[in-house]
């Protein structure tokens, strides 16, 4: 799996999980989240060569098509596969509220 | 939706469905498929600017992050959303066989 265990341990130009820390205030302009101040969002990036973690029949076909037609612009792309939620604390006036924001953290990637 | 109805009618630099015809023999080297000779596989391509058809909370966050941090390399990517199967005819010896290959045709795209 193209997850932290594999990607953060290997120098990988191909599609892999990349570390990205997002500071809510500085990077998103969000002042409303009290805790955490930021989080490890991560992101997916890198080349998708022939059959590198292809996720559907179509991406495998496209991968093969690119190998035979290297001048073609139709190639798979490195995107998130597994995502996890993030629990945040914010205030409604003086009242604290805990909320779970879905699909905020990328855990693994795929070529799609 | 970033589908044929929208994308094939508009000239769109941003993430959209693109037409792609694949000839099984010529483009994939597959000689085993008898019918069809090829099919409209389509593919997804184009830029994913700020919140253009972002598909998850993470891709929306990443999109906002890129707007505020334009020098960042962490940006969403244009990939397939809805896929459809393709029915093919091939032969095992002299015996014809009909098979449905799943996820062969891209019908719409998203920024992920």
């Amino acid at each position: 799996a193209l997850d932290a265990a594999y990607c953060f341990r290997n120098v990988q130009d191909n599609c892999c999980l990349r570390p990205l820390y997002i500071d809510f205030k500085r990077d998103l302009g969000w002042k409303w989240i009290h805790e955490p101040k930021g989080y490890n969002a991560n992101f997916c990036a890198g080349a998708c060569p022939y059959l590198w973690s292809s996720d559907t029949q179509h991406s495998r076909v496209l991968s093969l098509y690119n190998t035979i037609n290297p001048e073609a612009s139709a190639s798979p792309c490195c995107v998130s596969q597994d995502l996890e939620p993030l629990t945040i604390l914010y205030y409604i006036g003086k009242t604290p509220k805990i909320e779970q924001l879905s699909n905020m953290i990328v855990k693994s990637c795929k070529c799609s | 939706a970033l589908d044929a109805a929208y994308c094939f009618r508009n000239v769109q630099d941003n993430c959209c469905l693109r037409p792609l015809y694949i000839d099984f023999k010529r483009d994939l080297g597959w000689k085993w498929i008898h019918e069809p000779k090829g099919y409209n596989a389509n593919f997804c391509a184009g830029a994913c600017p700020y919140l253009w058809s972002s598909d998850t909370q993470h891709s929306r966050v990443l999109s906002l992050y890129n707007t505020i941090n334009p020098e960042a390399s962490a940006s969403p990517c244009c990939v397939s959303q809805d896929l459809e199967p393709l029915t093919i005819l091939y032969y095992i010896g002299k015996t014809p066989k009909i098979e449905q290959l799943s996820n062969m045709i891209v019908k719409s795209c998203k920024c992920s």
């Epitope: 205030y91 409604i92 006036g93 | 707007t67």
Partner: antibody
């Protein structure tokens, strides 16, 4: 500069619904919380609720809960306020307003207002 | 809900100091109150917020204080263009509430 442009005046019958839009420009729409406030001569200003773009967290005043829906379309930088089961007492000028940053906060920019008249 | 009480009207001479008060039904803390100015046919305009912050573009003759229960908007050397309705707003608790407004007349 920051601009919040709202939809025009509307006349509705009792029991109907109204949907008002608020198109934002001049700032990063997804970074700020958007509020909806209405004003009537009888009640003055009444806060209706707020919505946080991207994460779609909506907070509603108790008295509007169940018939108010606040949404934000980040692709078009537009906030929407839909009020259902309208009564004549809902005749008011409706404003969208951006907050300084917190969920409940001072409102630094306001739309021009949308007059909604509920009459049979 | 927190109730905010303001005097319905206030009249001051041109160049004099105007003090508009806003009394809360319970303590807000010093940082949860804002003042708005509204002129006929216009949307409200933020004047002060928090403990004593002035909104951008607001002249320094406007100042706000807040003890927690009673907040005061002070206009030192009132001008003709300051004639308007002034509203206080609390954001310490949901729902946000507003005062009924004070009509300021400049004589």
């Amino acid at each position: 500069q920051v601009l919040l442009v709202q939809s025009g005046a509307d006349v509705r019958k009792p029991g109907a619904s109204v949907k008002i839009f608020c198109k934002a420009s001049g700032y990063t729409f997804s970074s700020n919380v958007m509020h909806w406030v209405r004003q009537t001569p009888a009640q003055g200003f009444e806060w209706m609720g707020s919505v946080i773009p991207i994460v779609d967290i909506a907070t509603y005043a108790r008295r509007f809960q169940g018939r108010l829906v606040l949404t934000a379309d980040t692709s078009t930088n537009t906030a929407y306020m839909e009020l259902r089961s309208l009564k004549s007492a809902d005749t008011a000028v409706y404003y969208c307003a951006r907050t300084l940053g917190l969920v409940l906060d001072a409102m630094d920019y306001w739309g021009q207002g949308s007059l909604v008249t509920v009459s049979s | 809900d927190i109730v905010l009480t303001q005097p319905p009207s206030l009249s001051v001479n041109l160049g004099q100091t105007a003090r508009i008060t806003c009394r809360a039904s319970q303590s807000l803390g010093s940082s949860y109150l804002a003042w708005y100015q509204q002129k006929p046919g216009q949307a409200p305009k933020l004047v002060t917020y928090g403990a004593s912050s002035r909104a951008p573009g607001i002249p320094d003759r406007f100042s706000g204080t807040n003890s927690g229960i009673t907040a005061t908007l002070t206009i030192s050397g009132a001008r003709a263009e300051d004639e308007a309705d002034y509203y206080c707003q609390q954001y310490a608790d949901s729902p946000i509430t507003f005062g009924q407004g004070t009509k300021l007349e400049i004589k």
